[in-house]
């Protein structure tokens, strides 16, 4: 959690940001909240990025003011205009690019004062894995696939029955570059699978951690997946 306070003659106001991660090619949110004001026309929101000359986004007098917006953000940003009055200065960033990573500043001016807070924004690719029985294999095999990851993640298998076992000798992981030449498809195969067990395929890079679980019994297969963004620290 980054909490910033204002300086200068006016009173300072509290601004809070949360470090987050963007999935390249998708839309992302840069989170920022502040002490709300009664009048929308008195609120100014400025988003800046370290190393970028122009503004990322500016909102003042109840509407976007994009005359000083940097070219790299043109047509890609928006605030939640109806939520500004309640203290939400979060920025929606469309079509996240790898180059959008960096340090952002959320700078707020209201009738109560000024304040700002920095936000670390990471970019990469992450997706939910799906674990299935490999119906083309010549033995009891599971196949874990996730369509988009970047940077290259690690893949670790685990099982409920053999807790703490190292499956690296009985698994094989490959990374296949996707057509846009940045993200990669992750495929991991686990051999010597036993019935009446739950297996987990865990994919992790410095941005996200995703797990695909599969419970195999002789009569059915049950699957579950979840994804967690790492370093989502509030500031």
């Amino acid at each position: 959690l980054i909490i910033g306070f204002g300086i200068s003659g006016r009173h300072s106001i509290t601004v809070t940001t949360v470090a987050s991660a963007g999935n390249i090619g998708e839309d992302g949110i840069l989170s920022c909240t502040f002490e709300p004001d009664i009048k929308l026309s008195d609120i100014v929101i400025q988003w800046l990025k370290e190393g970028v000359l122009g503004l990322v986004h500016e909102f003042k007098e109840g509407k976007d003011e994009l005359s000083e917006q940097d070219e790299m953000f043109r047509g890609r940003t928006a605030v939640f205009a109806d939520q500004v009055i309640v203290g939400n200065a979060s920025l929606r960033l469309k079509n996240v690019q790898l180059t959008d990573a960096g340090t952002y500043k959320c700078y707020i001016i209201t009738s109560k004062g000024k304040g700002n807070a920095n936000l670390e924004y990471k970019t990469g690719a992450f997706s939910m894995p799906e674990v299935n029985v490999d119906y083309n294999a010549s033995s009891e095999t599971l196949r874990c696939e996730a369509p988009r990851w970047f940077p290259q993640p690690t893949v670790v298998w685990a099982s409920q029955v053999d807790q703490g076992a190292n499956f690296s000798e009985v698994s094989n992981t490959s990374f296949e570059l996707n057509s846009e030449n940045v993200t990669m498809k992750v495929v991991s195969v686990l051999y010597n699978v036993t019935i009446n067990n739950t297996y987990s395929c865990m994919i992790e890079n410095d941005i996200a951690k995703a797990t695909g679980d599969i419970k195999v019994t002789e009569s059915e297969i049950k699957r579950r997946s979840h994804l967690q963004l790492l370093n989502s620290k509030a500031s």
Partner: antibody, heavy 118, light 106 residues
Framework: DVLLQESGPGLVKASQSLSLTCSVT?????????WNWIRQFPGNKLEWMGY???????SYNPSLKNRISITRDTSKNQFFLRMKSVTAEDTATYYC???????????WGQGTTLTVSS | EIVLTQSPAIMSVYLGEKVTMTCSAS?????MHWYQQKSSTSPKLWIY???KVASGVPGRFSGSGSGNSYSLTISSMEAEDVATYYC?????????FGSGTKLEIK
């Protein structure tokens, strides 16, 4: 107990399509397991043809993949084998059977004999 | 595909004699299952998961093996054991059966 019962035309002409039905009692085909078709040729050779799983997924023997489809009617607790362009080589006894994942066929039907005439 | 080779193809044995038939897999499999088939009936599960005897199967039957090599044994042949026995692997796709061992009385 789980009972499987095959039914079919008995005799079909070469190049025609074939449809066989397996009616299951004593267990819902959507509750679990893998519901298979197996055939036994006149020389007694057994061949696994394919299955439909409890969740509707299919797996087929690659040697037959382009010629067969296995479907189901969950309301009647039945599953079906459809085969295109039959030839005399498809003359066999056709069995339906329940299979455990990676393991055995535990219940079989009594079989239905199919003769393909030219 | 995994090819299962059964031997011998035909066995002629005396009543009371010990019988061992084998099933060899072209690739290692985790489990082997055995089916008994008598003429004009469907195959019956006889031995499953390599060594477990199916319900209703006499105690004189046993199964063993691992990897590529499996066997079915009858400790003392009886007249009702006359049948064809098929091995089966359900681990690797496509699932495959052996060509069978036909058991007869001498």
């Amino acid at each position: 107990d789980v009972l499987l019962q095959e039914s079919g035309p008995g005799l079909v002409k070469a190049s025609q399509s074939l449809s066989l039905t397996c009616s299951v009692t004593g267990y819902s085909i959507t509750s679990g397991y893998f519901w298979n078709w197996i055939r036994q040729f006149p020389g007694n050779k057994l061949e696994w043809m394919g299955y439909i799983s409890y969740d509707g997924g299919n797996s087929y023997n690659p040697s037959l993949k382009n010629r067969i489809s296995i479907t189901r009617d969950t309301s009647k607790n039945q599953f079906f084998l459809r085969m295109k362009s039959v030839t005399a080589e498809d003359t066999a006894t056709y069995y339906c059977a329940r299979k455990a994942l990676w393991l055995r066929f535990d219940y079989w039907g009594q079989g239905t004999t199919l003769t393909v005439s030219s | 595909e995994i090819v299962l080779t059964q031997s011998p193809a035909i066995m002629s044995v005396y009543l009371g004699e010990k019988v061992t038939m084998t099933c060899s897999a072209s690739l290692s499999v985790s489990y082997m299952h055995w089916y008994q088939q008598k003429s004009s009936t469907s195959p019956k599960l006889w031995i499953y998961d390599t060594s477990k005897v199916a319900s209703g199967v006499p105690g004189r039957f046993s199964g063993s093996g691992s990897g590529n090599s499996y066997s079915l044994t009858i400790s003392s042949m009886e007249a009702e054991d006359v049948a064809t026995y098929y091995c089966f692997q359900g681990s690797g796709y496509p699932f495959t059966f052996g060509s069978g061992t036909k058991l007869e009385i001498k």
